[in-house]
């Protein structure tokens, strides 16, 4: 495939990545799938600078990111290492609360109204942010 050199329509470019900000809500798995169908992934926050950029665009609204612990340890959807990477959890989070009776914990991470992160029940219909890297080869065949 060819390298993507500019962001798709309605996506916002920032630091060699493209971001798309939803204006409706979906459960985490549905949001994850939406981004994948756009040849992207749920946003992976790797720096304080990126955190501030995303926070500016989403405002004080609960919003899914590409971080989950549905299979045990916390993982970023693009494989970025969680342990050594940037984190911005609320105090006392993540707590993986099991008390809601869902037969599982709070396995999906989201930006809260103040931008800090919380883990929550993955079924909540929060807004979401997709991200794709400009330098990534797109899946479209090159123009002949």
């Amino acid at each position: 495939g060819s390298e993507r050199t500019c962001c798709p329509v309605n996506w916002v470019e920032h630091e060699r990545s493209c971001y798309w900000f939803s204006r409706s809500g979906k459960a985490w798995a549905d949001a994850d799938n939406y981004c994948r169908l756009e040849d992207a992934h749920l946003v992976v926050v790797t720096s304080w600078e990126e955190q501030k950029f995303v926070q500016h665009h989403i405002g004080p609204v609960n919003t899914w990111m590409g971080l989950h612990d549905q299979n045990g340890p916390w993982k970023w959807v693009d494989g970025t290492d969680y342990e050594t990477g940037f984190k911005n959890w609320r105090p006392e989070q993540p707590d993986d609360w099991y008390g809601h009776g869902l037969g599982g914990g709070e396995d999906c991470a989201h930006f809260t109204d103040d931008g800090r992160w919380n883990d929550d029940v993955c079924q909540r219909p929060y807004r979401w942010v997709c991200e794709t890297e400009l330098d990534k080869a797109s899946q479209e065949p090159p123009l002949l």
Epitope: G25, L102, T112, D120
Partner: antibody
Amino acid sequence: QVQLVQSGAEVKKPGASVKVSCKASGYTFTSYDINWVRQATGQGLEWMGWMNPNSRNTGYAQKFQGRVTMTWNTSISTAYMELSSLRSEDTAVYYCARGGYDVLPGNNYYYDMDVWGQGTTVTVSS
Amino acid sequence: DIQMTQSPSSLSASVGDRVTITCRASQGISNYLAWFQQKPGKAPKSLIYAASSLQSGVPSKFSGSGSGTDFTLTINSLQPEDFATYYCHQYNDYPFTFGPGTKVDIK
């Protein structure tokens, strides 16, 4: 048994604030959301927002953003809804309702507002 | 926001009748829909969740169907205690929203 008991009726002047309480019993307070829903006389149901005392998360309908604050006191299993800058159109019965997610076969899910308070009448009049 | 509409807004029926109420969402909501019954001066009561699943303790004469944007609540063999207002409610997206209600009264 599981129940939500709300505070008594309030009469307020325009511009004032009102704080309605909702005391939960018969279940683990932190295991569920509390939703707030209001109903003007002869009108339908209007969802105002939700709060979760465990994750300390809240979500408000845009219409009430900036005017509503939902809080809680886990030690007494009580949720609160405060509405400020009251106007006559805020005259309504305000309900709290317990909410929670549950899983269905096939990894589907639903959200259940299964237990409601008795309602608190708020009258805004000069 | 997702708009919910209901029809009819009111209907008159007799004891023993079969009643059907429809609810339409302004966009697809899968099966993330509930139905509530409300009697005058009382809090709403949950009847149906996930469009078609009956809440425990609710008689089987109530049934729900539909997916996407169009949903139906059916009450078989209407009894005096069923005369009330019925609301549909979507929890597919925030803000959660309710339909305007359908009032079922005695003919």
